[in-house]
């Protein structure tokens, strides 16, 4: 991954914090709840982007070359945005305009654009859709996706908080 200009860490931190809050507002748990655990078997990881040790999102990895980690976060945001655009969230029960879900979608797009290098190719994913006999899955899937997104955003927010605290270029006073 080539080194390119660093993102606006402070703005990313603010947006990711806001996203965390929106994700919880969009799907507040019924009771006490732990975030989904990340330790899955290799064969069940499938296509869900997870921020892992080898992604360079630790303090040293970010210092050496933050682009590895940022690429992983970009992939994750694109993956979840794709799911939020799918039939799972578009079908009944319909989501109200300006609902927490709509705000979440808009903010997810905002952070993606902030991180998206101009020449970055868009990855194509197949849109999941539910057949008429699978409609019962929709509320469960919405819950499942949002829970997973909450876990992903919690880690991303920590990355941006660290970046804002340690990697922001100091302002050079002009004469």
């Amino acid at each position: 991954v080539p080194r390119s200009s660093s993102p606006d860490w402070a703005q990313c931190q603010q947006l990711s914090r806001n996203l965390c809050m929106l994700a919880w507002n969009a799907h507040a748990p019924a009771g006490h709840m732990n975030l989904l655990r990340e330790e899955e078997d290799e064969e069940t990881k499938n296509n869900v982007p997870r921020i892992q040790c080898e992604d360079g999102c630790d303090p040293q990895g970010l210092k050496d070359n933050s682009q590895f980690c940022l690429q992983r976060i970009r992939q994750g945001l694109a993956f979840y945005k794709h799911l939020l655009d799918s039939d799972i969230f578009k079908g009944e029960p319909a989501l109200l305009p300006d609902s927490p879900m709509e705000q979440l979608h808009t903010s997810l797009l905002g952070l993606s654009q902030l991180l998206q290098p101009e020449d970055h190719p868009r990855e194509t994913q197949q849109m999941p859709s539910l057949s008429s006999s699978q409609q019962w899955q929709r509320p469960l899937l919405r819950s499942k996706i949002l829970r997973s997104l909450q876990a992903f955003l919690a880690i991303a927010a920590r990355v941006f908080a660290h970046g804002a605290a340690t990697l922001t270029e100091p302002l050079v006073p002009t004469a």
Partner: nanobody
Framework: EVQLVESGGGLVQAGGSLRLSCAAS????????MGWFRQAPGKEREFVAA????????YYANSVKGRFTISRDNAKNTVYLQMSGLKPEDTAVYYC?????????????????WGQGTQVTVSS
């Protein structure tokens, strides 16, 4: 892999009650939700109810809403289906299933674990 064992099925009169249990073992930390499904002779397996393992949110098929209650005891790694106001059309083999948190495009799909089933017969 999660292993599931159902119990509690049997023969009951219409209007009666039964409580099914599903004991889970193995990698239960990777489970997103537990569900109950049923299959009547000559029919496809259908969704009955589900509960998220961690949050305890519940979901029901319209046909059982108000009559069936799904609950869980995380300490015992067990999920229950309390069935009341049973009707002859509730007669079926009831299956317990565990849905993994890792598959985000389907629930209780190919990566789910299934029990062997327990027979529920409601006589009129």
């Amino acid at each position: 892999e999660v292993q599931l064992v159902e119990s509690g099925g049997g023969l009951v009169q219409a209007g009666g009650s039964l409580r099914l249990s599903c004991a889970a073992s193995g990698r239960t930390f990777s489970v997103y939700a537990m569900g109950w499904f049923r299959q009547a002779p000559g029919k496809e397996r259908e969704f009955v109810a589900a509960i998220t393992w961690s949050g305890g949110e519940t979901y029901y098929a319209n046909s059982v809403k108000g009559r069936f209650t799904i609950s869980r005891d995380n300490a015992k790694n067990t999920v229950y289906l309390q069935m009341s106001g049973l009707k002859p059309e509730d007669t079926a083999v009831y299956y317990c299933a565990a849905d993994p948190s890792s598959d985000l495009v389907t629930v209780f799909g190919d990566s789910a674990s299934w029990g062997q089933g327990t027979q529920v017969t409601v006589s009129s």
